[in-house]
Amino acid sequence: DAHKSEVAHRFKDLGEENFKALVLIAFAQYLQQCPFEDHVKLVNEVTEFAKTCVADESAENCDKSLHTLFGDKLCTVATLRETYGEMADCCAKQEPERNECFLQHKDDNPNLPRLVRPEVDVMCTAFHDNEETFLKKYLYEIARRHPYFYAPELLFFAKRYKAAFTECCQAADKAACLLPKLDELRDEGKASSAKQRLKCASLQKFGERAFKAWAVARLSQRFPKAEFAEVSKLVTDLTKVHTECCHGDLLECADDRADLAKYICENQDSISSKLKECCEKPLLEKSHCIAEVENDEMPADLPSLAADFVESKDVCKNYAEAKDVFLGMFLYEYARRHPDYSVVLLLRLAKTYETTLEKCCAAADPHECYAKVFDEFKPLVEEPQNLIKQNCELFEQLGEYKFQNALLVRYTKKVPQVSTPTLVEVSRNLGKVGSKCCKHPEAKRMPCAEDYLSVVLNQLCVLHEKTPVSDRVTKCCTESLVNRRPCFSALEVDETYVPKEFNAETFTFHADICTLSEKERQIKKQTALVELVKHKPKATKEQLKAVMDDFAAFVEKCCKADDKETCFAEEGKKLVAASQAALGL
């Protein structure tokens, strides 16, 4: 449906408030270093222009594409070259190359200060003084730190953020009301950002086919009563939505997501019995609710898969006629029967099935050749099952912090070249799989754990891609999207690694550690642990544990001392000397 003016079309569809919010998100995700005020100015200019196009779609420049309009606007920023260096070269290009250039310069780890939460009274005053600016600032700060955040979902977060302040700034105990809500939004926001980052990586690095396969598997698990044709339609529409958002086309993405939610709710009866509550909610809540909806019950008496995909004499004929459709049907049928499998496992099974058909359909006796294909699935299913069992046992034995430490040691020994902050961040997140998934019954553990690990390992992959330092990481990240986790699991200690030279400064601590939150203190200790492994990769688990206990004793002692700083200086030297003597650092 061609419109004379795309910008007018989107403005009318989305409304002024959402239009402005989405343009702000788009600009902040592209120009991550620009001050808030500069972005607000650009957004206001674009909005004023959009209004002229709504009034008259034939007005000058109203027929231009959104990429052209937004790109031209971004390229008016005076300090582009000083602030962004070679990104300024994008402005010399024509669309669509210019937008591709901007996309390539998105930074997953921008050099921005950590967001420090002000006092509750300060936040409430700012909220009351200028609610609009306060909420815009939230969108801006999140978007620039998370350049792939799913924009329509960020609007939902902003709505909840506003609701939290509206309610809590009137409460008797503002802090008790507000802080848990902000913590929840922060944690959910980080998780949402990471999940979306995997979707974008899937599309950008492995292509539309990979994303569609993921979507077929996930939607078939979620909507097992829906027909294959219905699932295929949803997959096509969902792929369009995510392609747009990952490509920076946020207005189109939000508009199409709203259309998809509308379609799903209008066709609930042929999709899922679990959608009723979601579909009664307002738009942003509705879309979020649909995305998180629980799996519907499996239809009763589903026939055996073997009939159509192994025993039938028409397998090769059906495969040859439309390969991707036939594989899609296999994936749909397998996934709807297995909500207990992770999506990545289902995709591995589909890949194994595809490889077998490719080989066997060219053989003298195809049926004889592929007759035992389902037997090949057994080890693929057992591998994640065993891994999850072992790691959940370890988690239950150690608790989250020490489980994270075990993973820190494991991953530092696998890929010691990776930067310490990345190893700490990724291992801490890997360790959270325990509290997130091990509490679930067997039937829900694998989809929870392995699909979560895919999200976390993608963080490692995108951070490593920015500054590649390890061939092993590059190999695991690029060879196969669905085999990333097994690839990392299979890595042993890197025997080629030359231990890092000892630097006493790395192990120098100060009294400020005493006033840190428990989480920040853990991060300090975990940073020291990674550095220790980098210096002494052959140290045993027991030695590392003992040295970390010495470190804990040292911190505890000095935090109780009258002259903390002197204690840290003197006892810190002793701790380093003792560890050097014991480990031969």
Partner: nanobody
Framework: QVQLVESGGGLVQAGDSLRLSCAAS????????MGWFRQAPGKELEFVAR????????YYADSVKGRFTGSRDNAKNTVYLQMNSLKPEDTAVYYC?????????????????WGQGTQVTVSS
Amino acid sequence: QVQLVESGGGLVQAGDSLRLSCAASGRTFSDYAMGWFRQAPGKELEFVARINWSGTLTYYADSVKGRFTGSRDNAKNTVYLQMNSLKPEDTAVYYCAQRGDSGSNYDPSGYRYWGQGTQVTVSS
């Protein structure tokens, strides 16, 4: 199961010295820090010293600093507490303990295995 057996306690005069020993058997001795605690009559269990896994780092309670010295011999699975310039207020039952996997290094709850204790009495 870990077994800890203290020895070396006794009755001494103020200003004298004593050397306590604690022999361990069971799980790998050299993997864990060891602690010395004491309990005077009618008082709480009190931290005295922590000797790290390798014997290269020792922390003391302020009340014994400069007078007591902790050490260990991992080859013999034994930890020691050399007590000099003893005072009557050092009178207590002395316990050695092996560090657990969590909790404070200066609190009894942070230690998993305990000896039966040895009595030290300092007369004035």
